[in-house]
Interface confidence: medium
Amino acid sequence: EEELQVIQPDKSVLVAAGETATLRCTATSLIPVGPIQWFRGAGPGRELIYNQKEGHFPRVTTVSDLTKRNNMDFSIRIGNITPADAGTYYCVKFRKGSPDDVEFKSGAGTELSVRAKPSAPVVSGPAARATPQHTVSFTCESHGFSPRDITLKWFKNGNELSDFQTNVDPVGESVSYSIHSTAKVVLTREDVHSQVICEVAHVTLQGDPLRGTANLSETIRVPPTLEVTQQPVRAENQVNVTCQVRKFYPQRLQLTWLENGNVSRTETASTVTENKDGTYNWMSWLLVNVSAHRDDVKLTCQVEHDGQPAVSKSHDLKVSAHPKEQGSNTAAENTGSNERNIY
């Protein structure tokens, strides 16, 4: 009679976490008499998974009744699989011996892979805003996937980025894995509407990869440009001075008018106009009663944007060119801001 062979027909078995794995094993003969044991791994450090003769294996059930005399099916089911169960499982036939059973023949092994999808990537940007031409870092994290192989890409507005570093942890064998990547992005003035995308592709996903996004509007600060101009005289002794605050982001902005260094009025940008690139424009104006001034007036528009140090622009108002009106002591009217778009 031919010598007994232990057949493990499946080279590999894939199971989703939480499910049951079936590991198939059959023997080609009833002889020699002796039990079957299942192990994970080979060699001296192998782990006993199931012993037909003795022991308690709560997660393991046999596919057929091993107590039947003519049984040659030694397949098992392992319940509630986790990624920690991944490995190669061997079905081993023992020959009845005295005092101990002797290992007789092993199957070729079945590799159990546990699949787990990566979590949706989470992209986070810097804690503080940065201005154009500066380089900022974005991080992307995804967790809980298995097997370890994974691909991560970065995009800015659909264009792939190359300046990034990625780590998959842990380095060795593990229950499941995490990926962490840091990308460097150079900001431009046009980035208010830009998006940074982290894309993760894994063998458990079908079709399109998972994506995480960050809006650069949360990261960028575009400082304003200021222009102070003198408008034509509205009345014989009044001059209209405007301060155009252009191309700023975010909207948080406070403007102060100074006459010869003294605060005349402070206001907060409320009704702004939005440019196509997502930045804002705003205009404030001041009516100056020139008859109240003997000398030339230095008008300063001072802007504090998004909590940053103030920037300012000045305009020298020539008083000598205007006839003085007797008895007038009002230097400026609190006119509020002009809400029209100046473009």
């Epitope: 078995v13 894939l14 199971v15 892979s113 699949r115 691909t151």
Partner: antibody
Framework: QVKLQESGAELVRPGSSVKLSCKAS????????MHWVKQRPIQGLEWIGN????????HYNQKFKDKATLTVDNSSSTAYMQLSSLTSEDSAVYYC?????????????WGQGTSVTVSS | DILMTQTPLSLPVSLGDQASISCRSS???????????LEWYLQKPGQSPKLLIY???NRFSGVPDRFSGSGSGTDFTLKISRVEAEDLGVYYC?????????FGSGTKLEIK
């Protein structure tokens, strides 16, 4: 061995719905995506969508988004496709197919097909 | 959606001849994971389709070595080195890289 057993032929009225089934055996049902494919008489194959039984994650061909609903019952290792608001355009053979070879993402195994005829 | 264009629509051959079917995708079908999920299926009359080739050039188990797949990017080819009677039917290419997955229109291999 792997087998995908689809439900029998259906003759249905226009405007009604039908639920097709695909019972899987011989492999771990939750480990592989299940696909559904349409074939009209003397025509080619159209991919309808797929479902991951482990978490009911689905992808649809937009063309079938309002037509087909994919579900699974893991306890019976069965995948279902419900087709709604049926018209003569839905008369076709519908196949289920499974990715049986992990990591290769190919439809290794196919059901025998279910013929759906929409007629008044 | 990615359009898969197969040529020819019909391919008359003599038994023992070589047959070649072309499949062109309207855009690259390299998946983000790096693989190209281009498959070839054969559907014989009255039967379900059967997988022949996966990932461009890998023969599925049990498929004779007279079948071979090649190509990259957007251009792919299925070759049958010596056509046998059991090879007759309709061949479909399929991309499984980008949702929605799409089939080619099919090529009917028939006897001259």
């Amino acid at each position: 061995q792997v087998k995908l057993q689809e439900s029998g032929a259906e003759l249905v009225r226009p405007g009604s719905s039908v639920k097709l089934s695909c019972k899987a055996s011989g492999y771990t049902f939750t480990s592989y995506w299940m696909h559904w494919v349409k074939q009209r008489p003397i025509q080619g194959l159209e991919w309808i969508g797929n479902i991951d039984p482990s978490d009911s994650d689905t992808h649809y061909n937009q063309k079938f988004k309002d037509k087909a609903t994919l579900t699974v019952d893991n306890s019976s290792s069965t995948a279902y496709m419900q087709l709604s608001s049926l018209t003569s355009e839905d008369s076709a053979v519908y196949y289920c197919a499974s990715y049986g070879n992990y990591g290769e993402n190919a439809m290794d195994y196919w059901g025998q097909g279910t013929s759906v005829t929409v007629s008044s | 959606d990615i359009l898969m264009t197969q040529t020819p629509l019909s391919l008359p051959v003599s038994l023992g001849d070589q047959a070649s079917i072309s499949c062109r995708s309207s855009q690259s079908i390299v998946h983000s994971y790096g693989n190209t999920y281009l498959e070839w299926y054969l559907q014989k009359p009255g039967q379900s389709p059967k997988l022949l080739i996966y990932k461009v050039s890998n023969r599925f188990s049990g498929v004779p070595d007279r079948f071979s797949g090649s190509g990259s990017g957007t251009d792919f080819t299925l070759k049958i080195s010596r056509v046998e009677a059991e090879d007759l039917g309709v061949y479909y290419c399929f991309q499984g890289s980008h949702v929605p997955f799409t089939f080619g229109s099919g090529t009917k291999l028939e006897i001259k």
